[in-house]
């Protein structure tokens, strides 16, 4: 997260980290006791999922292995459309004050809405600085028309843009798959942006979760 600050402790109990061994790979969100939602470009063969602590490496955190993941069938490695994936935990997460399910959206929030993006990704770019504590930054949803002015034909229908004019506030590497939460519901998953991260007036691009609630529910049901 660029130009952010540590999240208020325990304010993101649905935030998870996907680790490769002990190394941060991506962010994600807990949908229920068995399922994590993240970005399709975060796909690996096996995951270690960190839950229940804002601090990576915290011994009190839950660590659960996951071996099965289901990319959206329409994901494209070229255009990055439909950049979302469900990861099935090998054992159930224990819900607590620090481990909660995210609220999936019942509607798409409009441009101008203030949202929070969070993650353990690098806080500097192109030189990298990985924080141990979960970082947050507030950004505003940007209309597709305004975002298309920046990204032209790179922007697809189910992509959502967010940023602050003339500001560096943005996601970065390591934040992928993590949540963009607006008015208490999950509206986006960190998908992509320009490099170096945090270039003013280059919005962050997110998978627009409100367009995929049916796929999310259907996939979890299908692979129960």
């Amino acid at each position: 997260i660029i130009d952010g600050a540590p999240c208020a402790r325990g304010s993101h109990p649905w935030q998870v980290a996907l680790l490769s061994g002990n190394q941060l790979h991506c962010g994600g969100v807990l949908v229920n006791e068995r399922w994590v939602l993240t970005a399709a470009h975060c796909k690996m063969n096996e995951y270690t999922v960190h839950l229940g602590s804002d601090t990576l490496g915290d011994r009190r955190a839950q660590r659960i292995k996951a071996s099965k993941s289901f990319r959206h069938p329409g994901y494209s490695t070229q255009t990055h459309v439909n950049d979302l994936m469900l990861v099935k935990l090998n054992s159930q997460a224990r819900l607590s004050s620090m481990v909660k399910k995210v609220r999936l959206p019942s509607r798409c929030e409009p441009p101008g809405t203030t949202c929070t993006v969070s993650g353990w990704g690098t806080t500097t770019s192109p030189d990298v600085t990985f924080p141990s504590d979960l970082m947050c930054v507030d950004v505003k949803l940007i209309s597709p028309q305004d975002c298309t002015k920046v990204y032209k034909d790179l922007l697809e229908n189910s992509m959502l843009c967010a940023g602050i004019p003339d500001s560096k506030k943005n996601a970065c590497n390591g934040d992928s798959g993590g949540p963009l939460v607006c008015r208490g519901t999950l509206q986006g998953l960190v998908s992509w942006g320009t490099f170096p991260c945090g270039q003013p007036n280059d919005p962050g691009v997110y998978t627009q979760v409100c367009k995929f609630t049916k796929w999310i529910n259907d996939t979890m049901k299908k692979h129960r």
Partner: antibody
Amino acid sequence: QLQLQESGPGLVKPSETLSLTCTVSGGSISSSDYYWGWIRQPPGKGLEWIGSIYYSGSTYYNPSLKSRVTISVDTSKNQFSLKLSSVTAADTAVYYCARGRPLGYGARHYYYGMDVWGQGTTVTVSS
Amino acid sequence: DIQMTQSPSSLSASVGDRVTITCRASQSISSYLNWYQQKPGKAPKLLIYSASSLQSGVPSRFSGSGSGTDFTLTISSLQPEDFATYYCQQSPPFPPLTFGGGTKVEIK
């Protein structure tokens, strides 16, 4: 400003291993979000990508050379190296090291362009 | 592997001419295409990345366009220092990263 400098023997015998080192100055390999790669150019021909290594240590190789190639990083010396085994005359080329600049973060991070190059070193394979 | 085909392989032009070089990918690569300039005895130099973004320090007479499989590098008004060989390059994520065969721009 970042500079890259290739070094290594200019003459290698057939069947031996070609070893080259790229020294990076003006920036750190270990803490910079870039790829570091090797490209070669046989005399009078085009460019061929050999492979790249990400700052975290992940390696990516050209499938046509994969069985013979090893790329590694020595962060203490701010260097990355190429080893190409079982060389033949077809491996005679100018070898370049280069920095790969990602085209974006997240899903666009796996794509890159080589924005800083060494000046190249000529390697001849001959007995 | 994705094949990159450049055309023409060589061309002759005069100072001030508008020059267009094309690059075709054997399958869609979205906008993940870069262009390089190489002068004899020198290392290549990145001109354009992501099909149309001008690399810092490169003169604005160079421009790139295209997406999917067909891409173009245009030099709006050829200058004496532009006589060189130009290569297109497809980015990964899946190796190999591949270059086109090159286009040599010569003085007419």
